[in-house]
Structure formats: structure tokens, C-alpha cells
């Protein structure tokens, strides 16, 4: 805006206008005329920087003339009216339409007044995120993949993770000319602790009101990690039966549990029930090491636990298990 009292006419337009590939967009351009100022506009002209000639002209007496009549249209200019609004609509936006345009009013007696507008041609990307299922490799591998397809300009991808790791981002031409597909991989050394945890892919693009967040639940395949619980070192003779539990974490899930001892098969007082081992009351002290062997698709792992059943005052203990 000019300072008050200058009495000058001013062309008003945004410095930048975004439009979407394939859509239509209006390049707004208005002549602001102070209240007392007399002006007469005989012509509106749109031209593109670096190109000779005009792409659109509206003449007071001849009306509109377009370089591409099917793609251009003056929004408000009409014959027989004051020419104050030079806004131009462009249809079927193409990548090559991006650039600097000049909107010019030929006004009398103030002369030609113009303004430049930068047209940004955008393409809204489609975003997907997916897990990359991995095994324990011992070295960094991609565990999640985030893809922003067909963006213009290219989308910006970042990752949020509490697990450590690093991104590996690449770009490739999109399906439509001038668009870009961005692929970002989240890379880390797989471990069983990572399995089931999540990382978040954040995609930023000027066509979005706010960043898009895509959460990926990670999958790491690993053989069973086995431990045995249920024994508290305080088991005594002539007390109630007790239970040992074979605790196994694995992906995929365990397919089988096998109980044994270091001496071979289970003794008669030990009965296997899947992941649990039932220890019946015994009448003499024992000192036995139990083995639980757990199998899944990736292999078998086992854990050992030595159980001692001791002599002791039964009145103080209600069973062989502290549970």
C-alpha cells in the first residue's frame, strides 16, 4: 500500500500463488484506486517472464485475446465495465506453467502499472509407510519404509524413534512428469527388544496443512529367548505341588515346549503341561536340573534351572512354591 495522500494507483497481487498439477488456479490481480483519483484502464496484460508477447490481453474495445484460449480466462474483466480486476484463471495446470508472471494495467493518465506473481505448481503426494520384516542380522538393515509418491516439490521425510537408528532417503521421478517420489528407510541393527516397538515417519509438504504422521510397528524375527520361573529356592519335602513356567519370547510364536533334565527324561514327580512343569510332592530330598527347550520357526533355544527340595519344618511352609 502507498502511504496516505500519495494519490497513486497501486496494483495489488500476492507475490506467490500455489496451484495443483492438473487443476485450475486463479492468479489474482487488482488495481487499487484511491477515492479521489481519476483513472481509466484501457488494457490488461498478462505476460510470462522470458517469453516474448503476451499470454492474455483484455482490451477496452476488443475484449479478451489469449495465447491458449482453452486454458486461460479473465475472471472478472468484461467489455463495457471499468477494468479494475485483471485476475486470470489458468486451467489444467502443467509443470511447465510454474514461473513468474507479470500482470499489467495500462491506465490513463497514470501510465502502466504492473506486479509480478510467482506461480508454484504443486502436486500433493500420497504417503505410505510399511514395516520391513527382518531377522537378527547383527548389522544395520532397513526395518521400516516410508514412501511419499508423486510430490512436487519433493516431500520432506523425517523419522522419530526412541530405538536409535538412522534414515536413508532417496528420490526418483514420479509417475507424472515433474513430480518426485521420495523413499526413506529407517535403518538399525535388529534385536528382540525392537520387535513390536514403533517408529514414526513424518512427511512434510507445502500442500499439507500439517505434517502427516505414519506409525510403523516393527517386526524382528528371532529365535526363542528362554527362562524358567516359579522357583524361589525355598521348596521343602511333604508340601503341596508346585509349578515351573517356561517363559519364552520369540517371533514367530513358539511352536513347541520340551521339558527334560540333565539326566534325561523327566522323573515321575515332574509332569510336563506345555509351557508349564508340574512338580508333585516328594518324600525325599532332590537336586534336579530341569531343561526347557523351546522351538519356533527360526530354531530352538533352552534354559536350565536347578531345583532343590530340602528337609525342613513343614509347619512354616505351606507348599513347595512361594506362589
Amino acid at each position: 500500500w502507498p502511504p496516505p495522500g500519495t494519490g497513486d494507483i497501486v496494483v495489488q497481487a500476492p507475490t506467490q500463488v500455489p496451484g495443483f498439477l492438473g487443476d485450475s488456479v486463479t492468479l489474482p490481480c487488482y488495481l487499487q484506486v484511491p477515492g479521489m483519483e481519476e483513472t481509466h484502464v484501457s488494457q490488461l496484460t498478462w505476460s510470462r517472464h522470458g517469453e516474448s508477447g503476451s499470454m492474455a490481453v483484455f482490451h477496452q474495445t476488443q475484449g479478451p485475446n489469449y495465447s491458449e484460449p482453452k486454458r486461460l480466462e479473465f475472471v472478472a474483466a468484461r467489455l463495457g465495465t471499468e477494468l479494475r480486476d485483471a485476475s486470470l484463471r489458468m486451467f489444467g495446470l502443467r509443470v511447465e506453467d510454474e514461473g513468474n508472471y507479470t500482470c499489467l494495467f495500462v491506465a490513463f493518465p497514470q501510465g502502466s502499472r504492473s506486479v509480478d506473481i510467482w506461480l508454484r505448481v504443486l502436486a500433493k503426494p500420497q504417503n505410505t509407510a510399511e514395516v520391513q520384516k527382518v531377522q537378527l542380522t547383527g548389522k544395520p538393515v532397513p526395518v521400516a519404509r516410508c514412501v511419499s509418491t508423486g510430490g512436487r516439490p519433493p516431500a520432506h521425510i523425517t523419522w522419530h524413534s526412541d530405538l536409535g537408528g538412522m534414515p536413508n532417503t532417496s528420490q526418483a521421478p514420479g509417475f507424472l512428469s515433474g513430480t518426485v517420489t521420495v523413499t526413506s528407510l529407517w535403518i538399525l541393527v535388529p534385536s528382540s527388544q525392537v520387535d513390536g516397538k514403533s517408529v514414526t515417519c513424518k512427511v512434510e509438504h507445502e500442500s499439507f496443512e500439517k505434517p502427516q504422521l505414519l506409525t510403523v510397528n516393527l517386526t524382528v524375527y528371532y529365535p526363542p529367548e528362554v527362562s524358567i520361573s516359579g522357583y524361589d529356592n525355598n521348596w521343602y519335602l511333604s508340601q503341596n505341588e508346585a509349578t515351573l513356567t517356561c517363559d519364552a519370547r520369540s517371533n514367530p510364536e513358539p511352536t513347541g515346549y520340551n521339558w527334560s533334565t540333565t539326566m534325561g527324561p523327566l522323573p515321575p514327580f515332574a509332569v510336563a503341561q506345555g509351557a508349564q512343569l508340574l512338580i508333585r510332592p516328594v518324600d525325599k530330598p532332590i537336586n534336579t536340573t530341569f531343561i526347557c527347550n523351546v522351538t519356533n520357526a527360526l530354531g530352538a533355544r533352552q534354559a536350565e534351572l536347578t531345583v532343590q527340595v530340602k528337609e525342613g519344618p513343614p509347619s512354616e511352609h505351606s507348599g513347595m512354591s512361594s506362589n
Epitope: H40, Q60, P109, G111
Partner: antibody, heavy 121, light 109 residues
């Protein structure tokens, strides 16, 4: 070349009207702005009005509003200025001037030779 | 009613430089006043020299230049020629009308 040729001298009585013509040649008449200016004997130049030849759109000096009418005939590329209710102080040389564009601004480019209007009883 | 004031007369030596000024009664002259300068030689039609403060008309010698000088519009003639002897008028725009100055009679002597 661009030329503006005005009609001949006029002698009018007070209260009468006068219509001065300005025939243009050498350029596209319909896309031009033409101003009318007068100079009374011993006085300075005084702007009366302008007209856009293509549409007949006008802007008058408020001093003359209601007494002056500007028109154009695009078929003959001629601009007209009619001044009514003539008074003795309307005695002056009346000029038409075509505005041209230089750079991004207008200027008083080409002038007619002037038409002397004498108002006398 | 705005009044536009010019020097009634000025004299310049051939090859010399002279500046004609144009003052507005309403305050400082700005680019919004669209200062124009026209020339009238004795017995000849008016001729436009400058438009829009500083835009020289086609065919006008480069020795003529328009500008704003302080709070006035100015026409500077650098390297005056005998044929530049003429009456020079300044014209200012005031939102809805043009106002002419009284003219400056320039003598090249």
C-alpha cells in the same frame, strides 16, 4: 506521420454553442486518449477534458462540467469538443492533443494547430 | 485550486546547462503528479518532451531530461542549442485534472 488537424476559426455570440473537430491520422485512433486544452489571450493554458477514443469514456475538468461534451467518430477518426452557453471569457485558442506513451508513462505527444474561437456580441 | 508556478523567463548560453522548475501550490511535487513538459516554438505546434516526470518522448534529444529536484519538478537542458529557444510548459496531474504552469520563456543567447 501522426497528425491532428483541427477545424477552422469560429466566431460565436454569447449563449451559443461551438463544436470544434480534430481529425487524427497516422495511428490507431480507437486506442488513443485525446485531451482538449485552451489558451485565452494573454492567459495560460487550461486543460478542459480528455476522452478515450475507443469507448468514448471521458473525464472533464469540473470547471467545464455541464457545458462541455466530448465525442469521437471512429469511422472518420475524428474527435469533437462542443462548448455550450458561450461567454466572452471562452474566447481562446482551443487545442486537441493526443497522449502517447513513453516508457511506462503518458505524455502530451502530438498537438493540433489550434482553433480560434471568438465569442463576441 | 492548485496553481503551478514556473520561472517566467530564463537565459542560457549555447552549450550551457539550464534547469527549469515547476512548483506546486499544494506542496511537494511527487511522481504521482505525473509531471509533463511541452515545448512551443514561435509559429509552431506544441511538442511533448517529457512524460511521467522523467520519461523522454521518442525523438527528443538526450540533452533534455526530467526529474524531481527537491520539492519541484525540473527540466534540465544540458548543452543548449539555438534551436532550443522556445516556451516550455510544465503540466501536473492532481487526481482528477491536469494543471498547466504559466510557462518559461527560454532564450539561448
Amino acid at each position: 506521420q501522426v497528425q491532428l488537424v483541427q477545424s477552422g476559426a469560429e466566431v460565436k455570440k454569447p449563449g451559443a454553442s461551438v463544436k470544434v473537430s480534430c481529425k487524427a491520422s497516422g495511428y490507431t485512433f480507437t486506442s488513443s486518449y485525446i485531451s482538449w486544452v485552451r489558451q485565452a489571450p494573454g492567459q495560460g493554458l487550461e486543460w478542459i477534458a480528455w476522452i478515450y477514443a475507443g469507448t468514448g469514456d471521458t473525464n472533464y475538468n469540473q470547471k467545464f462540467t455541464g457545458r462541455v461534451t466530448m465525442t469521437t467518430d471512429t469511422s472518420t477518426s475524428t474527435a469533437y469538443m462542443e462548448l455550450r452557453s458561450l461567454r466572452s471569457d471562452d474566447t481562446a485558442v482551443y487545442y486537441c492533443a493526443r497522449h502517447g506513451m513513453t516508457g511506462r508513462g503518458w505524455y502530451f505527444a502530438v498537438w493540433g494547430q489550434g482553433t480560434t474561437v471568438t465569442v463576441s456580441s | 485550486q492548485a496553481v503551478v508556478t514556473q520561472e517566467p523567463s530564463l537565459t542560457v548560453s549555447p552549450g550551457g546547462t539550464v534547469t527549469l522548475t515547476c512548483r506546486s501550490s499544494t506542496g511537494a511535487v511527487t511522481t504521482s503528479n505525473l509531471a509533463n513538459w511541452v515545448q512551443q516554438k514561435p509559429g509552431q505546434a506544441f511538442r511533448g518532451l517529457i512524460g511521467h516526470t522523467n520519461n523522454r518522448a521518442p525523438g527528443v534529444p538526450a540533452r533534455f531530461s526530467g526529474s524531481l529536484l527537491g520539492d519541484k519538478a525540473a527540466l534540465t537542458l544540458s548543452g543548449a542549442q539555438p534551436e532550443d529557444e522556445a516556451e516550455y510548459y510544465c503540466i501536473l496531474w492532481y487526481s482528477n485534472k491536469f494543471v498547466f504552469g504559466g510557462g518559461t520563456k527560454l532564450t539561448v543567447l
